[in-house]
């Protein structure tokens, strides 16, 4: 039995997968900030987690996915206000009793030190210093991401 949050996440991910393939992104769009091979957009309004997920989708992006501790630290360095929380693309899957990223992968327990409970209707937020489990209905800011396409040097054979 999937929760409404899980259904929302799956529906949006599937609709994103169905969309026509777009040319790769070489530079970050206006208002987006580059962090390594990603473009990040920090909201300044607040929403519950599922609305935040939907908003990123309308911007042809997803809620932030964090690969490892190093990426978390670099992202947190962009947050200058200690008091602000941002949703990322990680929530608790009741059916699998585990933290699940919106791309379908599960959280490696070593990646993030989460403060708070792992339970139904829990979603993950980050601040400048920490990672928190919050009720998904809590209205806070959020971070969207777009992947930059790596520029590969083309090698042309001798003519």
């Amino acid at each position: 039995q999937k929760s409404s949050i899980e259904k929302c996440s799956v529906d949006i991910q599937q609709s994103r997968n169905k969309t026509t393939e777009r040319p790769g992104l070489l530079n970050c769009p206006i208002y987006w900030q580059q962090l390594r091979e990603k473009c990040l957009l920090f909201s300044h309004t607040v929403n519950p987690w599922n609305n935040s997920l939907a908003d990123c989708s309308t911007k042809e992006s997803s809620l932030l996915l964090i690969r490892d501790k190093d990426e978390l630290i670099h992202t947190q360095n962009l947050i200058r206000d200690k008091a602000i929380l941002f949703w990322i693309g990680l929530n608790f899957s009741l059916s699998e009793k585990n933290w699940k990223w919106i791309n379908g992968s599960f959280l490696n327990s070593n990646d993030l030190e989460i403060r708070g409970d792992a339970k139904e209707n829990s979603c993950i937020s980050i601040s400048q210093t920490s990672v928190y489990s919050e009720y998904c209905s809590t209205e806070i800011r959020w971070i969207c991401q777009k992947e930059l396409t790596p520029v590969r040097n083309k090698v042309y054979p001798d003519s």
Partner: antibody
Framework: QVQLQESGPGLVKPSETLSLTCTVS????????WTWIRQPPGKGLEWIGY???????NYNPSLKSRVTMSVETSKNQFSLKLRSVTAADTAVYYC????????????WGQGTLVTVSS | EIVLTQSPGTLSLSPGERATLSCRAS???????LAWYQQKPGQAPRLLIY???SRATGIPDRFSGSGSGTDFTLTISRLEPEAFAVYYC?????????FGQGTKVEIK
Amino acid sequence: QVQLQESGPGLVKPSETLSLTCTVSGGSISSYYWTWIRQPPGKGLEWIGYIYYNGNTNYNPSLKSRVTMSVETSKNQFSLKLRSVTAADTAVYYCARDGGPWVPLDYWGQGTLVTVSS
Amino acid sequence: EIVLTQSPGTLSLSPGERATLSCRASQSVSSSYLAWYQQKPGQAPRLLIYGASSRATGIPDRFSGSGSGTDFTLTISRLEPEAFAVYYCQQYGSSPPTFGQGTKVEIK
């Protein structure tokens, strides 16, 4: 209610640096894109650039070589410096709050006329 | 950069009439990131419409926006005396954001 107020000299000599400050009241500067726009007398609007509260900037390519923006979150202020000014830089300079892809330029200062003349 | 061309340059109408202002972009405006502003003499511009069709806070419903891609329209259904002003369109979907040259709505 968010309010923005520009301040700075109204007269700048050619080849010197134009310096303006915008003070934000009624809201925190710790979010949004804080923007400068100018309007030469009797003409249209030109976007100069923005600074995000964490210091990230984006400038109009036509002015990029001469522009520097900075932000002081503790004072709720952001600033514009435009180097090597000429008479063509004479304009009303506005500061504004830009909500980016959500809601664009929703709050503006009343503008300040800067004249470049010797 | 995206060039926005507004037409007509001047629109002469009487109070109570309907005004239709056009804004055409030199290339497609990303995600309909197009806004309309009203400016009166000696004042800063005021945001009317964003996202091509969403009204800003406090803007009466006689102002409406439409369009997508390269063609956008601002419609004022009934011109009140205070609506006579200059109107600018702006795209904010690509850098640098750009403004149209403006349409002046004047009393006939």
